[in-house]
């Protein structure tokens, strides 16, 4: 059988074989892949990129969240989606997931001029059906994902908005447990709107095999700041492996190249 | 009170190691950073690296990251800092230090151990 | 990696006088600097964080200010016993860097 797919700090120190991420394979293995460097004065700017339009972020709901084995993931079922942004199209909410790291300066994938943060925060959309603009676009679609993502720093007061979802991580410790959050929004997990209003495009992959190469992404410029403790309650409270030996952290595949593609700014 | 108390002054012979450490008292251990720095006679303070020790994570200064290894003792809140192939470059006074927030300010430091590296 | 320069290495005061310190970054970070004084003999003591925010237990005259690549550390009456070197440090970018020193001496 083939080896399950992982990241680095899981085959370092467990004793089962895995796939780390310079051997994942097929799309892994491509040329328009995800995350990267983004240096902040070589993207352009883009007056198309204007303000997004968030639909059911503000509603209040009991999300269900699990641990994957790779993250701890919402499960938002399309009851929030987003349109605006530069982006062709409504895009419906499937989860939300993050990336991290037990130390301040590498949790997050992307990168800002070679700056990494405490963490990262991916929110995935999928392209509304029949709204695709051409034939060609609807059979083989570079778009079919949208991905917010918004790095996230230590600041030093507690996010309330992320109490919800630290809180619950003490109950999925395992994989495949799941468990329900108290009461929250989408939006209590963002910054301001007004810091919303600055962000880079460009044009790549899922960050995980398959690695599809049909993700047009969203990197906010402005951190999402967390406290040290909720930062670190993710470290501290998930395993990778159901006998708890290996703690989640460092759930981050290296930069990729950017290659000919070309970043663009709001 | 927090402290953190560090072993005392070393002689060592070029080209031995050496480990040093620094036990915290008054919070709770797994909580906070560890870094480590270094303090030349008459010079600047140099970061070394950190440590978390509740989950033995390491992060290096790239000028350090053949120099120095970080490591932590969680039952008797101790940090150690091991110092290998030494030679008179690495005679200073060498600190440790509690980190305030995730990634910023130091709030608390040790009293400092003292390494000279002679023949 | 993001430089720190302090300015001036030397400053001579005397008791009561009102001093300031320099700091400047080489680029922008925010008010992401914080102050230590480091008396001969001792280990650096925390005064002010990120930028301008007091520490509990440090005498009221210290104060700073400043934010982007241009930052100050104010004493509004020395005493003798703030002689002392006094370092800032940056922890907006990795590594953390701290300025080469002030030195804080009596006329």
């Known amino acids: 059988a083939e080896s399950h797919w992982c990241y680095e700090v899981q085959a370092e120190s467990s004793n089962y074989p895995c796939l780390v991420p310079v051997k994942w394979g097929g799309n892994c293995q491509k040329d328009r892949q995800s995350p990267i460097n983004i240096v902040t004065t070589k993207a352009k700017v883009d007056k198309k990129l204007g303000r997004f339009f968030f639909s059911g972020y503000d509603k209040k709901q009991t999300w269900t969240v699990q641990n994957n084995g790779h993250s701890v993931m919402m499960l938002l079922e399309n009851k929030a989606s987003i349109s605006g942004g530069g982006l062709p199209a409504p895009y419906q909410a499937k989860q939300l997931h993050l990336h991290w790291s037990d130390l301040p300066y590498k949790g997050s994938e992307h990168s800002l001029d070679g700056e990494h943060f405490a963490m990262e925060m991916h929110i995935v959309h999928e392209k509304e059906k029949g709204t695709s603009r051409n034939v060609k676009e609807a059979q083989d679609p570079e778009d079919e994902i949208a991905v917010l993502a918004f790095l996230v720093e230590a600041g030093t007061q507690v996010n309330e908005g992320f109490q919800p979802l630290v809180e619950a991580l003490s109950n999925i410790p395992k994989p495949e447990m799941s468990t329900t959050m108290a009461e929250s929004s989408l939006l209590d997990l963002l910054p301001k709107e007004e810091k919303l209003r600055h962000y880079f495009r460009y044009l790549g992959s899922l960050t995980t095999p398959t690695c599809d190469e049909k993700v047009v992404w969203t990197v906010f410029r402005e951190p999402i700041q967390l406290h040290r403790e909720q930062i670190l309650a993710f470290s501290q409270k998930l395993y990778y492996d159901k006998e708890q030996t290996v703690s989640m952290k460092d759930n981050v595949r290296p930069l990729q190249q950017l290659g000919q593609r070309t970043v663009i700014k709001s | 009170d927090v402290q953190l108390v560090e072993s005392g002054a070393e002689l060592v012979r070029p080209g031995t190691s050496m480990k040093m450490s620094c036990k915290a008292s008054g919070y709770a251990f797994t909580n906070y950073l560890i870094e480590w720095i270094k303090q030349r006679p008459g010079q600047g303070l140099e970061w070394i690296g950190v440590?978390?020790?509740?989950?033995?994570?390491?992060h290096y200064n790239e000028k350090f990251k053949d120099k120095a290894t970080l490591t932590a003792d969680k039952s008797s809140s101790t940090a150690y800092m091991q110092l290998s192939s030494l030679t008179s470059d690495d005679s200073a006074v060498y600190f440790c230090?509690?980190?305030?927030?995730?990634?910023?300010?130091?709030?608390?430091w040790g009293q400092g151990t003292t390494l000279t590296v002679s023949s | 990696q993001i430089q720190i320069t302090q300015s001036p290495a030397i400053l001579s005061v005397s008791p009561g006088e009102r001093v300031s310190f320099s700091c400047r970054a080489s680029?922008?970070?925010?008010?992401?600097i914080h102050w230590y004084q480091q008396r001969t003999n001792g280990s650096p003591r925390l005064l002010i964080k990120?930028?301008?925010e007091s520490i509990s237990g440090i005498p009221s005259r210290f104060s700073g200010s400043g934010s982007g690549t241009d930052f100050t550390l104010s004493i509004n009456s020395v005493e003798s016993e703030d002689i002392a070197v006094y370092y800032c440090?940056?922890?907006?970018?990795?590594?953390?860097?701290f300025g080469a020193g002030t030195k804080l001496e009596l006329k």
């Open positions: 990120y930028a301008s």
């Open positions: 440590i978390n020790p509740g989950s033995g994570g390491t």
């Open positions: 440090q940056q922890s907006n970018s990795w590594p953390t860097t």
């Open positions: 230090a509690r980190e305030g927030d995730y990634g910023s300010r130091f709030d608390y």
């Open positions: 680029q922008s970070i925010g008010t992401r």
